[in-house]
Amino acid sequence: SGTTNTVAAYNLTWKSTNFKTILEWEPKPVNQVYTVQISTKSGDWKSKCFYTTDTECDLTDEIVKDVKQTYLARVFSYPAGNVESTGSAGEPLYENSPEFTPYLETNLGQPTIQSFEQVGTKVNVTVEDERTLVRRNNTFLSLRDVFGKDLIYTLYYWKSSSSGKKTAKTNTNEFLIDVDKGENYCFSVQAVIPSRTVNRKSTDSPVECMGQEKGEFRE
């Protein structure tokens, strides 16, 4: 039930990567508009994206206040010309989202290899510590700041001349690996949160190879 020509939102879906978090839903509006509300389990509702014809709402600013909280959102539907109108029960038509806990559920973005440096038979590979939109004391925190030792990286590396791969793990953003002198290697990294049960791994970083501009070589 609801106001004439107004339909409830459906397929409410959280899309979140490195804490940038957007709520999406359907349908594309026809003669109606939407308003989103978000709250923690114990908090008050806060309205966002007022009377919008979009079918998404950026809720990043709300969820970064405490990424370990569990959030619930709801999408209200109103007739386009009469946003004061309510459903038959005396309140606007709305639909609830699934619960969302950013710390446990945000997707890990594709990492980037910042640099690699060879010294003799050792190579130091550094992963860029991506900045998030999570703030503490007016500074944006990095992925490592937020996740600490919960975040590890897996490195895949192989000789440019062969298909045999090796792997290494780190709980920092650096790898120090042994290589054969005079051989060029290629590298790819993946972010992992082993304690999670879902959204545990990122996609692989772009492959970087020695002999290209990112690296440095020292005897």
Epitope: T154, T167, K169, P194, T197, R200, K201
Partner: antibody, heavy 117, light 107 residues
Framework: QVQLLESGAVLARPGTSVKISCKAS????????MHWVKQRPGQGLEWIGG????????MYDPKFQGRVTITADTSTSTVFMELSSLRSEDTAVYYC??????????WGQGTLVTVSS | DIQMTQSPSSLSASVGDRVTITCKAS??????LSWYQQKPEKAPKSLIY???SLADGVPSRFSGSGSGTDYTLTISSLQPEDFATYYC?????????FGGGTKVEIK
């Protein structure tokens, strides 16, 4: 619940190949790494290699490189290990195991491979 | 390749004893060290992950410690069901390597 169910015991001739399987349930193999471990009778554990089903990367112990191939079929949640040019010292129990990133937290029941003429 | 030296290779102990098993890596493995228990004709079972964390369902008498190259598995009060073989595993880099195992037998 998480389970790894391995294929049954195999008797193989020297010089031939075997392909054993490990069917996972209770989790998505693309979210984890999958490994194979060898244990000869009365001996310790030996890592053969592993695979990341999400991106198809496979890594092998140099001792097995060239003789072993580890693959994963994400549509059936099954991991395979093929071992070729079999010799008597390949007679062993082969275990598949799930790697969370912190540990091999779940193991299959083991597949006995006997190499004999 | 990283070598894992596990000691002792065997030990005899009584129920109630405190048992300590050590693993030494040939280089820093950054806590990517796990411990396993194996009973005859059974698959290994995960006990400790990330050097110090107790795996689900494992009794609290088991504990892990260490960092860098030196790691320890401790059983604070040995129980009858703890008689088994224990292995450490480094998975910080490939090839992954197991310790040689420690067989815990009844005195």
């Amino acid at each position: 619940q998480v389970q790894l169910l391995e294929s049954g015991a195999v008797l193989a001739r020297p010089g031939t190949s075997v392909k054993i399987s490990c069917k996972a349930s209770g989790f998505n193999i693309k979210d984890y790494y999958m490994h194979w471990v060898k244990q000869r009778p009365g001996q310790g554990l030996e890592w053969i290699g592993g695979n990341d089903p999400a991106n198809k990367h496979s890594m092998y112990d140099p001792k097995f490189q060239g003789r072993v191939t580890i693959t994963a079929d994400t549509s059936t949640s099954t991991v395979f290990m093929e071992l070729s040019s079999l010799r008597s010292e390949d007679t062993a129990v082969y275990y598949c195991a799930r790697d969370s990133g912190y540990a091999m937290d779940y193991w299959g029941q083991g597949t006995l491979v006997t190499v004999s003429s | 390749d990283i070598q894992m030296t596990q000691s002792p290779s065997s030990l005899s102990a009584s129920v109630g004893d405190r048992v300590t098993i050590t693993c030494k890596a040939s280089q820093d493995i950054k806590s990517f060290l796990s411990w396993y228990q194996q009973k005859p004709e059974k698959a290994p079972k995960s006990l400790i992950y990330y050097a110090t964390s107790l795996a689900d369902g494992v009794p609290s008498r088991f504990s892990g410690s260490g960092s860098g190259t030196d790691y320890t598995l401790t059983i604070s009060s040995l129980q009858p069901e703890d008689f088994a073989t224990y292995y450490c595993l480094q998975h910080g880099e490939s090839p992954y390597t197991f310790g040689g195992g420690t067989k815990v037998e009844i005195k």
